[in-house]
Interface confidence: low
């Protein structure tokens, strides 16, 4: 009963993680224009990972999707490999533990067969949310990078030199909504793991009580599982969506000229 | 909100220039791509030229290219713009207009009529 | 240059009545981006222009929704499905993918 539990709460977690990590991949305020220094501006920028946002005072926005894919820079573009393979995997696990779920009877299905689908469905889940977590540290410390690179700059505006101040970005609610998910997706991951050691064949536990009545009865014992993200902090100092495809039709995010479109 | 407030009527003598400013409220300048439009009197809308954020210049259109200047001030947030050798021709309401972002026209000033008159 | 062409240059409307402009441009209006940077502008007597219809058929922020706009590559229309009083004015379309930008002639809506 404790093991269906848990493969069926290990499974409902992971879905909300997945369907939280999908909502942070499409949502478009992944950096927000951090209002600090003018609290009271008339447009209001975001950007997401497809698309850069303005949204005017008078509540009316415009979007505008990122038109080039080789212009964009490697760490978006990472972040983005990253969410939509923790997505892919996450909706792969889901499937897969679809139909290991105790609960849920598929002809003559082994429950051995229905504890390797278990823990197979749990190992992905933990690798799509670590996926979900990675992407988003990924741009949180791009952004965090940014933010502190974003000091007063000289250009040419029109007809002489302009001092401005660059406009500096902050966490956007779609990297706690992917934190969150992330999270929960690999939680879930870990409870089906833990699941899957009680879904094994009931004579073996007989066997095992009936060979070694003074030890711990042990029916499935699965294999060490290491996952690790392979990122290491990004300290160039890079900009967001810099060198991207620019149309005459544009005009940029406050307050530079040029936008990253 | 974004407002955009232009100087007062001017009356100018033939050969004479005239500078029209237009200065941004509720926004920084720099944030704004500027274009100047005139309208003569009965007349349609005229571009004279503004800002191109592909090229980080100012385009003038051909016909005012050498007696216009277009220029901002981002300390007072006010730009600027300038024309020469005035002929009765250029007797028009002269306005200033933002492209914020991905489209033109957003805001306009409320217009500043300039009369060429010997 | 692109030159924008407006037909009716005056249209005399019924109140409550719709009406219908015409724009056309001497090439597609389609930028590199994929989009169209097809823009109509409302002048009223003794006012300066204002946004109404932007890439082709969106609405600015503030314009009622009996304005619509329409059209493709070279051609465009603004429509106005009910005529109201305060819908008197100028009516100018305007390209914005390429430099210089260039408007239509206008056209005048006044009522019969």
């Known amino acids: 009963m404790a093991v269906t539990a848990c493969q069926g709460l290990g499974f409902v977690v992971s879905l909300i993680g997945i369907a939280g990590i999908i909502a942070a991949t499409c949502m478009d305020q992944w950096s927000t224009q951090d209002l600090y220094n003018n609290p009271v501006t008339a447009v209001f920028n975001y950007q997401g990972l497809w698309r850069s946002c303005v949204r005017e005072s008078s509540g009316f926005t415009e979007c505008r999707g990122y038109f080039t894919l080789l212009g964009l820079p490697a760490m978006l573009q990472a972040v983005r490999a990253l969410m939509i393979v923790g997505i892919v995997l996450g909706a792969i696990g889901l499937l897969v533990s679809i139909f290991a779920l105790k609960c849920i009877r598929i002809g003559s299905m082994e429950d051995s067969a229905k504890a390797n689908m278990t823990l197979t469905s749990g190992i992905m889940f933990i690798v799509s949310g670590l996926c979900a977590i990675a992407g988003v540290s990924v741009f949180a410390n791009m952004l965090v990078t940014n933010f502190w690179m974003s000091t007063a700059n000289m250009y040419t505006g029109m007809g002489g030199m302009v001092q401005t101040v660059q406009t500096r970005y902050t966490f956007g609610a779609a990297l706690f909504v992917g934190w969150v998910a992330g999270g929960l997706t690999l939680i879930g991951g870990v409870m089906m793991c833990i699941a899957c050691r009680g879904l094994a064949p009931e004579e073996t536990n007989y066997k095992a009580v009936s060979y070694h009545a003074s030890g711990h009865s042990v029916a499935y014992k699965p294999g060490g599982f290491k996952a690790s993200t392979g990122f290491g902090s990004n300290t160039k100092n890079k900009k967001i969506y810099d060198g991207g495809a620019r149309t005459e039709d544009e005009v940029q995010s406050y307050p530079s000229k040029h936008d990253y479109v | 909100q974004v407002q955009l407030v232009q100087s007062g009527a001017e009356v100018k003598r033939p050969g004479a220039s005239v500078k029209v400013s237009c200065r941004v409220s509720g926004y920084t300048l720099t944030a704004l791509s500027m274009y100047w439009v005139r309208q003569a009197p009965g007349k349609g809308l005229e571009w004279m030229g503004g800002f191109d954020p592909e090229d980080g210049e100012t385009i003038y259109a051909q016909k005012f290219q050498g007696r216009v200047t277009m220029t901002e001030d981002t300390s007072t947030g006010t730009a600027y713009m300038e024309l020469s050798s005035l002929k009765s021709e250029d007797t028009a309401v002269y306005y200033c207009a933002t492209r914020l972002r991905y489209f033109d026209w957003n805001y306009w000033g409320q217009g500043t009529p300039v009369t060429v008159s010997s | 240059d692109i030159v924008m062409t407006q037909t009716p240059l005056s249209s005399p409307v019924t109140l409550g009545q719709p009406a219908s402009i015409s724009c056309r441009s001497s090439?597609?209006?389609?930028?590199?981006?994929?989009?169209?940077?097809l823009s109509w502008l409302q002048q009223r007597p003794g006012q300066p222009p204002r946004l109404l219809i932007y890439?082709?058929?969106k609405r600015f922020s503030g314009v009622p929704d009996r304005f619509s706009g329409s059209g493709a590559g070279t051609d465009f229309t603004l429509k106005i499905s009910r005529v109201e009083a305060e819908d008197v004015g100028v009516y100018y379309c305007?390209?914005?993918?390429?430099?210089?930008?260039?408007f239509g002639q206008g056209t005048k809506v006044e009522i019969k």
């Open positions: 890439k082709v058929s």
């Open positions: 090439q597609s209006l389609v930028h590199s981006d994929g989009n169209t940077y």
């Open positions: 305007t390209q914005g993918t390429q430099f210089p930008r260039t």
